[in-house]
Interface confidence: low
Amino acid sequence: AVNGTSQFTCFYNSRANISCVWSQDGALQDTSCQVHAWPDRRRWNQTCELLPVSQASWACNLILGAPDSQKLTTVDIVTLRVLCREGVRWRVMAIQDFKPFENLRLMAPISLQVVHVETHRCNISWEISQASHYFERHLEFEARTLSPGHTWEEAPLLTLKQKQEWICLETLTPDTQYEFQVRVKPLQGEFTTWSPWSQPLAFRTKPAALGKDT
């Protein structure tokens, strides 16, 4: 049995994945729950099993097709339901009319690499993963650099207000180990949010040449 209020949040990665988290204040005791996706304009539907991620929240990924296939468009509506088993029946715990392109969260950028490194600067590039062609160039990025002795939370955010898949980090300290992360967000969508941060890229600036200020 389920009591208490629930929150049901889903995001579309713009291609073939809808990730959902369902939070429930009340206790779920040995109950099997799933998310069911029923698109309004497609001849398919999809289900995923909700798995616990904390004491009161569950998550699952609706895999709609091949990772780079464009499974939904800007005018699709997907009815998403949380269904939990009660005996031999399924009970609807939550429901929403999901507009994929109003609820976007892209995959984290991938393939980070150092293009060129010097004593005080470093040029880094990356690629976006599984992003819809619908966006064209309407994407923005945030980047951060981890300096020695600091935490990621303390790192200042660098904002790139256009689809620019590279950055030149300036005013770095010579012969110093850094880490770099980037994330991406489409400009489209009322409830769109930032992608997860990329895997950190570690790099080291070149040492200063003896007797020279480079």
């Epitope: 698109p39 309004d40 304009r41 497609r42 001849r43 468009t73 800007t74 005018v75 509506i77 009815t79 429901i95 929403q96 009319d97 507009k99």
Partner: antibody, heavy 119, light 106 residues
Framework: EVQLLESGGGLVQPGGSLRLSCAAS????????VHWIRQAPGKGLEWLGV???????DYNAAFISRLTISKDNSKNTVYFQMNSLRAEDTAVYYC?????????????WGQGTLVTVSS | DIQMTQSPSSLSASVGDRVTITCQAS?????MYWYQQRPGKAPRLLIY???NLASGVPSRFSGSGSGTSYTFTISSLQPEDIATYYC?????????FGQGTKVEIK
């Protein structure tokens, strides 16, 4: 058999309001979106908005400030309300439903109801 | 908004003629639909998803195209085909229709 039946048309004063009903039979409005489309005399078709199965709406931006689409699931009926009417809102108003999926286009239409805005 | 431009706006053809109507979208669309409307009647869906025939529609009607350019064809015009034909896009809101093509018999 899927049927849509509009009602509530007639003569409306300029500046007045319009409330139309679309009674659905042969399907549930909790399972399908219902759209409103109008056609001015001798003119083409103009999409106004939709109410989806779960109750959310999408409107044509040109009408969003004066248009409300709602529904009563228990009566299986969709309602269309437009305010601040003017002469150019004179038209036949249709409700329509897609096939099993929107992908199938507007497969089902009501017969239409004529609204005349005039003093 | 995506503008849909149909041509011609009207045409007159003989029974048995092949009739072609084009619809040009102001930007690329993924889904195109065609409707027939007889005087005093509600529109009737003929073609969905660019080229698929709706239920009960005779095979003389067909559709094709992609991107911004779409075509609707009546392979052999019949007297009952006298009507106005509309294209419609369902790729972005607001949904928009062409201005219509009135087909008459010579």
């Amino acid at each position: 058999e899927v049927q849509l039946l509009e009602s509530g048309g007639g003569l409306v004063q300029p500046g007045g309001s319009l409330r139309l009903s679309c009674a659905a039979s042969g399907f549930s409005v909790t399972s399908y979106g219902v759209h409103w489309i109008r056609q001015a005399p001798g003119k083409g078709l103009e999409w106004l908005g939709v109410i989806w199965s779960g109750g959310s709406t999408d409107y044509n931006a040109a009408f969003i400030s004066r248009l409300t689409i709602s529904k009563d699931n228990s009566k299986n009926t969709v309602y269309f309300q437009m305010n601040s009417l003017r002469a150019e809102d004179t038209a036949v108003y249709y409700c329509a439903r897609a096939g099993d999926y929107n992908y199938d286009g507007f497969a089902y239409w009501g017969q239409g109801t004529l609204v005349t805005v005039s003093s | 908004d995506i503008q849909m431009t149909q041509s011609p706006s009207s045409l007159s053809a003989s029974v048995g003629d092949r009739v072609t109507i084009t619809c040009q979208a102001s930007s690329s669309v993924s889904f195109m639909y065609w409707y027939q409307q007889r005087p005093g009647k509600a529109p009737r869906l003929l073609i969905y998803d660019t080229s698929n025939l709706a239920s009960g529609v005779p095979s003389r009607f067909s559709g094709s195209g992609s991107g911004t350019s779409y075509t609707f064809t009546i392979s052999s015009l019949q007297p009952e085909d006298i009507a106005t034909y509309y294209c419609q896009q369902w790729s972005t809101y607001p949904l928009t229709f062409g201005q219509g093509t009135k087909v008459e018999i010579k």
